[in-house]
């Protein structure tokens, strides 16, 4: 039975040309997480396994820092990257948990974080 | 020394699907990507997608998808492509080809291809 | 996707020369373009990554250079073996794209 729950950063926003951490956290499970997958839509943007470590998509390689932890960090943001992103667990026994952030980047200077996991 | 072998060419019939198989020896499978190639004549090499088997995360071309489905048998070392729906335009050479897992975007060792023919 | 142009689909040359096969990509790549060599067998081989980094076990007489949106793969001094079709490949965006591919022959 699937006992784990994910938390993330939720709805977050972000300045043009900024960078934002991207962050989930898998909770009330002992199972073992073996990767986690950060993918936007059907797109891979990286992959952290626990055996190989990381590995950065072509498409985002310039532009996406491994870290901290599992995260993500997204720099050089464009309003191209608003949307949704997902930060998949593959974990041994429970199986596969998926969170869920929305991310909005914003042309404005004023730019909020979501109520977790606040970046400073 | 590192070898992908193939399994031998298919002739196949309009809307029926086929399954190609990748034997990879020599390496550690988990470690690479297996990429998948097609090779029509006069239309060069075409990215259909790829594998990591120690996890069977997979990325597809658009063009591919839906089409295309990849899997793993870690047990033997083999990757598979099913490619289904097959029309006169799915004749050509297929290759797996295999990339290090991080950031090493080129396909070092490739298998001898795969020649399939679609025809009623 | 990006699109990778090999002006070029076939070259003919004489042993010993220096040949130079072209790409050119729809938009700047960055410097990230791998070359392959296919022989009339069908054996595809990594011969350069990175623009010009030469793969292990590849003669000397392979180099690769480039930037921007135009690459280019020299062979110094043309043997028999050379005989094949060459690729560029992109690795700045998914999905990965190829060249149409240089056919390399002996005069």
């Known amino acids: 039975m699937m006992t784990g729950t994910i938390e993330t950063t939720g709805n977050i926003s972000a300045e043009k040309g900024g960078s934002i951490i991207l962050q989930c956290h898998l909770s009330s499970t002992t199972a073992q997480v073996t990767q986690v997958n950060w993918e936007q839509q059907d797109q891979l943007l990286a992959i952290c396994n626990a055996d190989l470590g990381w590995h950065i998509s072509p498409s985002f390689k310039d532009r996406v820092a491994p870290g901290p932890g599992l995260g993500l960090t997204l720099q050089s943001l464009t309003v191209n990257d608003t949307g949704e992103y997902f930060c998949i667990y593959h974990t041994y026994p429970d199986g596969t948990y998926t969170g869920r952030i929305f991310l909005e980047v914003l042309e404005s200077s004023v730019a909020e974080h979501g109520a977790r996991f606040q970046i400073p | 020394q590192v070898q992908l072998q193939q399994s031998g060419g298919e002739l196949m019939k309009p809307g029926a699907s086929v399954k190609i198989s990748c034997k990879a020896t020599?390496?550690?499978?988990?470690?690479?990507?297996i990429e998948w190639v097609k090779q029509r004549p006069g239309h060069g090499l075409e990215w259909i997608g790829e594998?990591?088997?120690?996890?069977?995360?997979?990325y597809y071309n658009e063009k591919f998808k839906g089409r295309a489905t990849f899997t793993a048998d870690k047990s033997s070392n083999t990757a598979y492509m099913q490619l289904s729906s097959l029309t006169s335009e799915d004749s050509a050479v297929y290759y797996c080809?295999?990339?290090?897992?991080?950031?090493?975007?080129?396909?070092?060792?490739w298998g001898q291809g795969t020649t399939l023919t679609v025809s009623s | 996707a990006i699109q990778m142009t090999q002006t070029t689909s076939s070259l003919s040359a004489s042993l010993g020369d220096r040949v130079t096969i072209s790409c050119s990509a729809s938009?700047?790549?960055?410097?990230?373009l791998n070359w392959y060599q296919q022989k009339p067998d069908g054996t595809v081989k990594l011969l350069i990554y990175y623009t010009s980094s030469l793969h292990s076990g590849v003669p000397s007489r392979f180099s690769g250079s480039g930037s921007g949106t135009d690459y280019s793969l020299t062979i110094s001094d043309l043997e028999p073996e050379d005989i094949a079709t060459y690729y560029c490949?992109?690795?700045?965006?998914?999905?990965?794209?190829f060249g149409g591919g240089t056919k390399l022959e002996i005069k």
């Open positions: 594998i990591l088997p120690g996890s069977g995360s997979s």
């Open positions: 490949h992109q690795y700045s965006k998914l999905p990965y794209t």
């Open positions: 938009q700047g790549i960055g410097n990230y």
């Open positions: 080809a295999r990339q290090k897992y991080g950031n090493f975007y080129y396909f070092d060792f």
């Open positions: 020599g390496y550690t499978f988990s470690n690479y990507w």
